[in-house]
């Protein structure tokens, strides 16, 4: 099994153009893909959770926030390799002794079932079929999200899968 470089990556610099341009569209940037009202970036390379968080921030986005089981399923359906895992924006808050999303909200008991320890320095990743916790220092791929916005002359290919 060859390691997949990843499903999607991004170049958000504004001075790059597609060689075939189209009019303004509500669309995702190059390499990102639209999933309902979000643009998602599935990284190619790997990082510890904190670095992944920072990388999304540099791209004016955030690590993936999953609102419900349906969104989890939609996202997992885009992962076509069982062996690949992606950090999301959820980690364990030692002070509050609970899983906390990076937007400050806490995980509700019926949102996601996390396999693994809930302890200090635990962060959450998703695979094709499950949700796990792992040491935040582990290097993994990650998923960034941003809201769908108007992008001038930047049309993503129909599919990057």
């Amino acid at each position: 099994q060859k390691p997949s470089i990843g499903k999607c990556s991004v170049d958000i610099q504004q001075n790059r153009t597609k060689t075939t341009e189209r009019p303004d569209l509500l669309n995702c940037p190059i390499y990102w893909q639209q999933v309902q009202e979000k643009c998602l970036l599935f990284s190619h390379t790997v990082n510890p959770w904190n670095n992944s968080l920072a990388d999304c921030s540099t791209k004016e986005s955030s690590l993936l926030l999953i609102q419900d089981k349906d969104e989890l399923t939609r996202t997992q359906n885009l992962i076509h390799d069982k062996a690949i895992s992606f950090w999301i924006g959820l980690n364990f808050s030692l002070s509050e002794k609970n899983w906390k999303w990076i937007n400050g909200s806490f995980l509700s008991s019926n949102d996601l079932k996390i396999t693994g320890d809930a302890k200090e320095n635990s962060c959450v990743y998703i695979s094709q079929t499950s949700v796990y916790s792992e040491y935040c220092s582990t290097e993994m791929k990650w998923i960034c999200q941003k809201e769908l916005t108007l992008v001038r002359n930047k049309v993503s290919p129909d599919s990057w899968l």
């Epitope: 060859k2 390691p3 997949s4 470089i5 990843g6 990556s9 991004v10 170049d11 597609k18 060689t19 075939t20 190059i30 390499y31 970036l41 990284s43 190619h44 390379t45 790997v46 990082n47 510890p48 670095n51 920072a54 990388d55 540099t58 791209k59 290097e139 990650w142 960034c144 290919p157 599919s159 990057w160 899968l161």
Partner: antibody, heavy 121, light 107 residues
């Protein structure tokens, strides 16, 4: 100025060792995965090795696996390639290369000028 | 490993000519393909990434197309500075691989 500058090449006998360095400047080195790519005289490009931004994950071409080791020191903005058990077929110009985007391994938008490694007795 | 086969291996052309270089992958790579230009004694230069996106500063006479296994680099009107060797590179799975190169020579 955004640049990569390789050093450490030279003439070495078969079975010998060399350590290449690549000094980065003008961009946030620690945010990017980095690669080494080589080119034998008169031949095409061959990817050699890659390392993640934090340095914990490495990949190698089959042709160098077990002989070469890629590493990095983000505090020094420097990429390394330790080459052991060198063979004549390792003779090439070695380039370090940076990808376009910090989430990618490839699509190299920045290359060094290269350093020549010659393996000969 | 994914093999990339470039054709032709060399082409003779004149200034103003339209030049087309193809790159075929041994298996599907979606749009994960880049094109580079290299001149003698110099490092490669990124021209096109993600099959069809023009790198900043690259003249618009260069264009890329294709998806899956078949890709094309086109130079719409060859200029004197375009005489060089061109390589395709896949970024779908590791190891990263390059095509064998296409040398564009003066006719």
């Amino acid at each position: 100025e955004v640049q990569l500058l390789e050093s450490g090449g030279g003439l070495v006998q078969p079975g010998g060792s060399l350590r290449l360095s690549c000094a980065a400047s003008g961009f946030t080195f620690g945010q990017y995965a980095m690669s080494w790519v080589r080119q034998a005289p008169g031949k095409g490009l061959e990817w050699v090795s890659a390392i993640s931004a934090a340095g914990g994950t490495t990949y190698y071409a089959d042709s160098v696996k077990g002989r070469f080791t890629i590493s990095r020191d983000n505090s020094k903005n420097t990429l390394y390639l330790q080459m052991n058990s060198l063979r004549a077929e390792d003779t090439a110009v070695y380039y370090c290369a940076k990808p376009l985007d910090s989430s990618q391994w490839a699509d190299f938008d920045l290359w060094g000028r290269g350093t020549l490694v010659t393996v000969s007795s | 490993d994914i093999q990339l086969t470039q054709s032709p291996s060399s082409v003779s052309a004149s200034v103003g000519d339209r030049v087309t270089i193809t790159c075929r992958a041994s298996q599907g790579i979606s749009s994960w393909l880049a094109w580079y230009q290299q001149k003698p004694g110099k490092a490669p230069k990124l021209l096109i990434y993600a099959a069809s996106f023009l790198q900043s500063g690259v003249p618009s006479r260069f264009s890329g197309s294709g998806s899956g296994t078949d890709f094309t680099l086109t130079i719409s009107s060859l200029q004197p500075e375009d005489f060089a060797t061109y390589y395709c590179q896949q970024a779908s799975v590791l190891p990263i691989t390059f095509g064998g190169g296409t040398k564009v020579e003066i006719k």
